[in-house]
Every structure is written in C-alpha cells, then in structure tokens.
Amino acid sequence: VPRWRQQWSGPGTTKRFPETVLARCVKYTEIHPEMRHVDCQSVWDAFKGAFISKHPCNITEEDYQPLMKLGTQTVPCNKILLWSRIKDLAHQFTQVQRDMFTLEDTLLGYLADDLTWCGEFNTSKINYQSCPDWRKDCSNNPVSVFWKTVSRRFAEAACDVVHVMLNGSRSKIFDKNSTFGSVEVHNLQPEKVQTLEAWVIHGGREDSRDLCQDPTIKELESIISKRNIQFSCKNIYRPDKFLQCVKNPEDSSCTSEI
C-alpha cells in the first residue's frame, strides 16, 4: 500500500536537486579563487540538513544557520546590487560590471537560484511531487525561509551606496511584499549605508515618463528616509543601451541620458 503523502500546492523539488546543488558548488568554487578550498560535500550536507526530515511548513532561519556559516563569503560591501522583479537584467549587469554583486553572484545565492526543494517530516526523502506554496500553503517553507535568511544577511552586509534595480513595467514598481520590500529594505544598516540609489528600468521604447515620481517609489523613499538613509532615483529609459554603455563606456552615445 503506497504511503499517504501530503499534497502541496506548489511544484515539487527540482529534479536532480542534490546533484544540481553539488555541481553548482563545484563550478562556483572553480570560478571564484577565494572559494577554491571549499568542500562542496560539506556545503551540501549542511543544505540538506536544513530541510530533510523536517515539516516543510515549519522551517526556521535557525535550520539554515549551519549552511549560512559554511557559505560565509566576503563581498565588497559597497558593490551590492539589489533587485526586485527584474532579475535577468540585474544578472546581465553584474556579468558585465564584474565588481558588482547580486545575491545570486554569491555562493549561496548561486546554489539555490531558480530551484525548489522540500522534504517530509520524519523521513529522509526529498519531496519531488509537491512543495508548499508561499501563499496557498505556508510562508515558513524551505525555499521562502532560505531566501529570507540569505537576503537579510546580504542586506545587513551592505555599506556606502547600495543600488537597487526595479521594474518600471510593473503596476507596483516598488512592492512592499517583495523580498526587497519586506526583507532587504528593513535590514540595510543606517550606520553603514549612506544612500540607496534606485534604478527604475523602463519597458517601453517610447516611455519617457519620470517613473521616479511614481507613488510606490515615493513610498520607498519615505521608508528609507525614516531609516536615516538617503535616497536617490534614476530612470533607465533604455535598458539595452544601458548595458551596452556599461560594456563600452567610451562610446560617444553614452554621454546622453539612458
């Protein structure tokens, strides 16, 4: 008789999850010389230990502490790029501007990017059928708690001028319920962070509105100002040109507004 299994509303663990995490870890340590000595099996064991045999709606930040310790990494604190709802462009940017880092450019962010995982209470099995959905099932699920934990730590580490890339095509350019809005904004340290600079990325080619005047951006400015951090905002009217100018800043067309 097949054992009854909890059916969750979200997709199950990404197939070949253990192999994927291990392979990503090895690849990351090969690309980043400062991580060359890292034992990826230990990293995977700590990752696994955070959610295996635990109820997938009862995961805590504490469960991830062994992994956080092993994943400790020094990123230049004044070169941090946060993003909300515009991951691809943020990653394209840091691939060109190699001295800037998104969370997914760190080991832990790189390991988990675009993956789903969960286990089952009291069994060592990984659940490949379904995992809890943040809205429909529970917020304290393995994936959500992981991103909340690493995002908080990433924001806490930031200093000087912190940049955030926001999607100007969305109805809420700044969304209080996003990871950026609910976690990162509130964990920037005013004693270390001088300014949060928002880059609002325009979607339409003919869109010349000043999206820095958007009510949600004003809301972000208000939250940030109340935390004694300065706020500035820039419109990026042409994201394609923006990336091109990051690649080739000497290009004559890059002096005009982008």
Epitope: P33, R36, H37, V38, D39, Q41, S42, V43, K69, L70, T72
Partner: antibody
Framework: EVQLLESGGGLVPPGGSLRLSCAAS????????MSWVRQAPGKGLEWVST??????????YSADSVKGRFTISRDDSKNTLYLQMNSLRAEDTAVYYC??????????WGQGTTVTVSS | QSVLTQPPSASGTPGQRVTISCSGT????????VHWYQQFPGTAPKLLIY???QRPSGVPDRFSGSKSGTSASLAISGLQSEDEADYYC???????????FGGGTKLTVL
C-alpha cells in the same frame, strides 16, 4: 617529473635579511598557486605564505607571525618563487619548504632550505 | 598562530589498525577540505590523503581519510613498521586566509 629546489638559506643575525628562492620544473608554473611552509627544529609544520597564479589575481597571503616582515613573490618568466625575509628573529629559525598547489592542496614539496637566525 | 588539534602520539603493533584524529572549527575543517601529510625524520612532507579521502597514486590503500563536521581522521590498517613517521592534517582557514596544520602526531609501531 615535478621538482622544486629551494636555495638561499643560511646563518643570519637577528634583524637581518635573506631572500629564499624556489626553482620549479616539470609543471606549468604560471598556472600554479605556490606556498612557503616552515618547520622549526623539533616542531611541527607552520604555513608562512601563499601566492595565487597571476590569472587568479596573483594575490599574496601571509601568516600573522610574518606579516610586514616577509614578502612572497613570483617570477613566472624564470619559473621561480621567492620569499623575501626582513627583520629576522630567532623564532624564524626553521627549515623552509616551498610547495606547489594542485588546485586546492599542496601536492609536491621541495627538500627545504635551512634558515638560522642567531648572533 | 592557532593550529588544528591532533594527538601528539599514537602507537600500534604490526597488522593493527590505528586512527589519528584532527579537530578544527567551521572556518577551516567545517567548510574546507582536509589533507594529510606523512613526514619521515629529516625529509620533506609527502602528500598522503587529499580532499578528505582521496589517495594520490602510489599511496597504499591501507591509508584512508574521512571527515565529519569539524573533525577529520586518518586511518591506517594493517600497520607496518615503515609507517612509523609524523602525520599532519592541514586545512585552509577562511578567517585567517591561510593554511592551518595540525600539531602533528608521531606514530610508533611497537
């Protein structure tokens, strides 16, 4: 065959200087991270310095006990690793080994050169 | 300079199995690979085990390494008189940005 040959050791008074060399052969020196490790008489191994390959930034690392006094460097055109030792102290007396990395561990060691700091 | 913790001595009779432990912290053994070196008097250290449990070619399979959490161990089975030597564990330490060695274990074959 991979070979590492240290030279430059000797007797030096406290406060003096020495430059150790390590001539490498049998592998692509340019790509290798390299280290110096020492062993005081009758004692255990103690890491001194490591230098990355130029392609990995050429970054040097040194133990706190030698920081500001010892400098690791490399000359890829000569396949040679160096350790410039200044302000030498009695506690720096040791056999100094040079070692090559195989990605993330030290796999081959030289035979060592003896440094004695004494007046 | 802090070191990884090893017992100063170990002993066994020929044919026996002996184990040498090496303990550290999260910033060295916990996070990074452990390697083992064998050293005979008056000679340079020789790589015995790398990346926790891998044996370089030429090292007999009587030697094995393992790691769990912040500790590692070297096991020698079927002990032979020629195994009498000093054994050192080593791991990179991310806090120090450098290598840490164990204090060394002198193995005596009785």
């Amino acid at each position: 065959e991979v070979q590492l040959l240290e030279s430059g050791g000797g007797l030096v008074p406290p406060g003096g200087s020495l430059r150790l060399s390590c001539a490498a052969s049998g592998f692509t020196f340019t790509n290798a991270w390299m280290s110096w490790v020492r062993q005081a008489p009758g004692k255990g191994l103690e890491w001194v310095s490591t230098i990355r390959s130029k392609t990995d930034g050429g970054t040097p690392y040194s133990a706190d006990s030698v920081k500001g006094r010892f400098t690791i460097s490399r000359d890829d055109s000569k396949n040679t690793l160096y350790l410039q030792m200044n302000s030498l102290r009695a506690e720096d007396t040791a056999v100094y080994y040079c070692a090559k990395y195989d990605y993330n561990y030290m796999d081959v060691w030289g035979q060592g050169t003896t440094v004695t700091v004494s007046s | 300079q802090s070191v990884l913790t090893q017992p100063p001595s170990a002993s066994g009779t020929p044919g026996q199995r002996v184990t040498i432990s090496c303990s550290g912290t999260t910033s060295n053994i916990g996070r990074n690979y452990v390697h083992w070196y064998q050293q005979f008097p008056g000679t340079a250290p020789k790589l015995l085990i790398y990346r926790n449990s891998q044996r370089p070619s030429g090292v007999p399979d009587r030697f094995s390494g393992s790691k769990s959490g912040t500790s590692a161990s070297l096991a020698i089975s079927g002990l032979q008189s020629e195994d009498e030597a000093d054994y050192y564990c080593a791991a990179w330490d991310d806090s120090l940005n450098g290598w840490l060695f164990g204090g060394g274990t002198k193995l005596t074959v009785l």
